[in-house]
Amino acid sequence: MMTGTIETTGNISAEKGGSIILQCHLSSTTAQVTQVNWEQQDQLLAICNADLGWHISPSFKDRVAPGPGLGLTLQSLTVNDTGEYFCIYHTYPDGTYTGRIFLEVLESSVAEHGARFQIP
């Protein structure tokens, strides 16, 4: 019987060009975590395997960093990064637990675009 629960950062927002940390935490189970997959929709971002360590998908290697912990850091965010992210915990003997995070990437503040008015 699967007794565990996944806590996530939930719905989060970040500015274009910035960074964000995606975090999930598995609790209320003594099951052993053998692997955590991070996915965006159906695309694999990264794997953290208990034996082999971290793998970052080739297409994300310049913008994704492992950690902290079992989390994932997304860098140089673009509006195209807006969407659902999933942390998939493979555990023994429980099986698979999945957490969901929704990220919204917002256009940067006025500061990035420069002042709109000249101060006399």
Partner: nanobody, 116 residues
Framework: EVQLVESGGGLVQPGGSLRLSCAAS????????MGWFRQAPGKERELVAA????????VYADSVKGRFTISADNSKNTAYLQMNSLKPEDTAVYYC?????????WGQGTLVTVSS
Amino acid sequence: EVQLVESGGGLVQPGGSLRLSCAASGSIFSGNVMGWFRQAPGKERELVAAISNSASSTVYADSVKGRFTISADNSKNTAYLQMNSLKPEDTAVYYCARDWNLFDYWGQGTLVTVSS
């Protein structure tokens, strides 16, 4: 510079099998983990399977679990990918890499086409 040469691809019917080989001019491992990747037309290159240099641990993409088996022979500087129960969606160019994160050396790949 280490050369990687993949071979064993070809045309196979759905449900068929192929065994891919990856021969390296030096060690097949540049770190602790080597992997097989694939790239289908119009898609990003993705991990298929990986294996530790002690061969004690393996990882598989969910889409190939139970069908593909990765192995490595350090004495021959060669890695293998046994592919069974092939599906049309397995059609891609398959590459090996000496590290599953540092993509400095790629071979030319070997084309696998699954079609009836």
